[in-house]
């Protein structure tokens, strides 16, 4: 069905055309599947194109940035949003993603996130580290997530909400599912994977796959011949 093609294959979806094409501009609505409407900015800008970097969510920005309207501190406010430099310790904040790595937002102020001072179950937000196309469930560069998880002494199991792959138990990675990020199994040899054509092209990402496991790389399946280059099947293969 069209549904399964668009959002139910285990891959990050690249639905609208790149920036400059016929796709929606920031703030437009994009239909991702029959019966579903996704509204958000165009997520196809690359790292090395023009500045400032447009965004719809914190997760589209770099490690030391958050997504916001230039004149406002909070994301989600009307107008075009761009990636802004993160806020250092003791600066005002409205959410964890606004604070620089190693800090979190408490009572409107960026504080050092020394876990020893956080009570068990305290909610803390961090950064998802994507190590590259073969080692990240996303676009191949570090980015923030606006979602959170609770700090537990045990690692997240399959289906647990997470911030980063290190929150998940061995053999799992942190990847998007619907409007959350959860722990999912790392891919094994022969399983279908997602290889992005260029940095930054992470599409709508309603569903993300994990990266390929150790010793594996996401490559075009040799016996998979298709007329369209863009629809070539990638699988996890031995180096």
């Amino acid at each position: 069905t069209l549904n399964s093609v668009l959002i139910n294959s285990n891959a990050i979806k690249n639905l609208p055309p790149p920036l400059g094409g016929a796709g929606g501009q920031p703030g437009s609505a994009v239909s991702v599947a029959p019966g579903v409407l996704y509204e958000g900015g165009n997520k196809y800008q690359t790292l090395d194109n023009y500045q400032p970097y447009p965004c719809a969510e914190d997760e589209e920005c770099g490690t030391d940035e958050y997504c916001s309207s230039p004149s406002r501190g909070a994301a989600g406010v009307g107008g075009v949003q761009i990636c802004l430099a993160c806020r250092k310790r003791r600066k005002r904040c409205m959410r964890h993603a606004m604070c620089c790595p190693g800090n979190y937002c408490k009572n409107g102020i960026c504080m050092p996130s020394d876990h020893s001072h956080l009570p068990r179950g305290e909610i803390e937000e961090g950064i998802i580290e994507n190590l590259g196309n073969d080692h990240g469930a996303g676009d191949g560069y570090p980015r923030r997530t606006t979602l959170t998880s609770k700090i537990y002494h045990t690692k997240g199991q399959e289906g647990s909400v997470c911030l980063r792959s290190s929150d998940c138990a061995t053999g799992l990675c942190c990847a998007r599912h619907f409007w959350s990020k959860i722990c999912k199994p790392v891919l094994k040899e022969g399983q279908v994977c997602t290889k992005h054509r260029r940095k930054g092209s992470h599409g709508l990402e309603i569903f993300q796959r994990c990266y390929c496991g150790e010793g594996l790389a996401c490559r075009i399946q040799k016996d998979h011949h298709q007329t369209s280059n863009s629809s070539r099947l990638h699988t996890c293969q031995r180096h």
């Epitope: 549904n3 959002i7 139910n8 285990n10 991702v32 599947a33 019966g35 579903v36 409407l37 996704y38 509204e39 958000g40 719809a56 969510e57 914190d58 997760e59 997504c67 909070a74 994301a75 989600g76 409205m94 959410r95 964890h96 993603a97 937002c105 909610i123 937000e125 997530t145 606006t146 979602l147 959170t148 998880s149 609770k150 399959e158 289906g159 647990s160 909400v161 990847a175 599912h177 619907f178 409007w179 959350s180 959860i182 999912k184 199994p185 309603i206 569903f207 796959r209 994990c210």
Partner: antibody, heavy 117, light 111 residues
Framework: EVKLVESGGGLVKPGGSLKLSCAAS????????MSWVRQTPEKRLEWVAS???????YYPDSVKGRFTISRDNVRNILYLQMSSLRSEDTAMYYC???????????WGQGTSITVSS | DIVLTQSPASLAVSLGQRATISCRAS??????????MNWFQQKPGQPPKLLIY???KQGSGVPARFRGSGSGSDFSLTIHPVEEDDTAMYFC?????????FGGGTKLEIK
């Protein structure tokens, strides 16, 4: 303690509008995706809308163009603006979130809407 | 959309006995190595409460009496031993595909 408290329900005529609110506390609201789910008088549960922490919004066809989900991350409130209401929109409306796993593990008590002339 | 069919629509079980509710999906809800099937309990005048997620994992504070099983398109919720307090409606729900959908519900009564 996590709390979700809905308000704004009531009786409205077909074609009318209504805005629901969901006040959240006990967690860092701005970092979590939020959803609205409704339950019809026949007890059928239906997903109505969701919004990510960054403000991206998602709707099923049944409410697309009529309902708008939004959030105020300063006041910790989730909204559902409903317009062009129909009799089939009559339901108990719940706000829900996923704090520990992908499923909706925290729900409010709900607010009732009746669309009738 | 994925359609979930629950059976039976209602059942009455004696105190201490086993109650089993079935949920069949119109297509597999397995993806990413996870079965995206959840179970909720709803008592009169209350919102739904998450019992089981990922087919068999228990939600926070859910007693071990509630067990979920199954994969693909066939799932079940088992309550054993059944207690008086378990009188409620039980719903299955899939989170594999957008839109998330719910089963029609099963009404459990304790004899």
């Amino acid at each position: 303690e996590v709390k979700l408290v809905e308000s704004g329900g009531g009786l409205v005529k077909p074609g009318g509008s209504l805005k629901l609110s969901c006040a959240a506390s006990g967690f860092t609201f701005s970092n979590y995706a939020m959803s609205w789910v409704r339950q019809t008088p026949e007890k059928r549960l239906e997903w109505v809308a969701s919004i990510s922490g960054g403000g991206d919004t998602y709707y099923p066809d049944s409410v697309k163009g009529r309902f708008t989900i939004s959030r105020d991350n300063v006041r910790n409130i989730l909204y559902l603006q409903m317009s062009s209401l129909r009799s089939e929109d009559t339901a108990m409306y719940y706000c829900a979130t996923s704090l520990e796993n992908y499923a909706m593990d925290y729900w409010g008590q709900g607010t009732s809407i009746t669309v009738s002339s | 959309d994925i359609v979930l069919t629950q059976s039976p629509a209602s059942l009455a079980v004696s105190l201490g006995q086993r109650a089993t509710i079935s949920c069949r999906a119109s297509e597999s809800v397995d993806d990413f190595g996870i079965s995206f099937m959840n179970w909720f309990q709803q008592k009169p005048g209350q919102p739904p409460k998450l019992l089981i997620y990922a087919a068999s994992k228990q939600g926070s504070g859910v007693p071990a009496r509630f067990r979920g099983s199954g994969s693909g398109s066939d799932f079940s919720l088992t309550i054993h031993p059944v207690e008086e307090d378990d009188t409620a409606m039980y719903f299955c729900q899939q989170s594999k595909e957008v839109p998330p959908t719910f089963g029609g519900g099963t009404k459990l009564e304790i004899k």
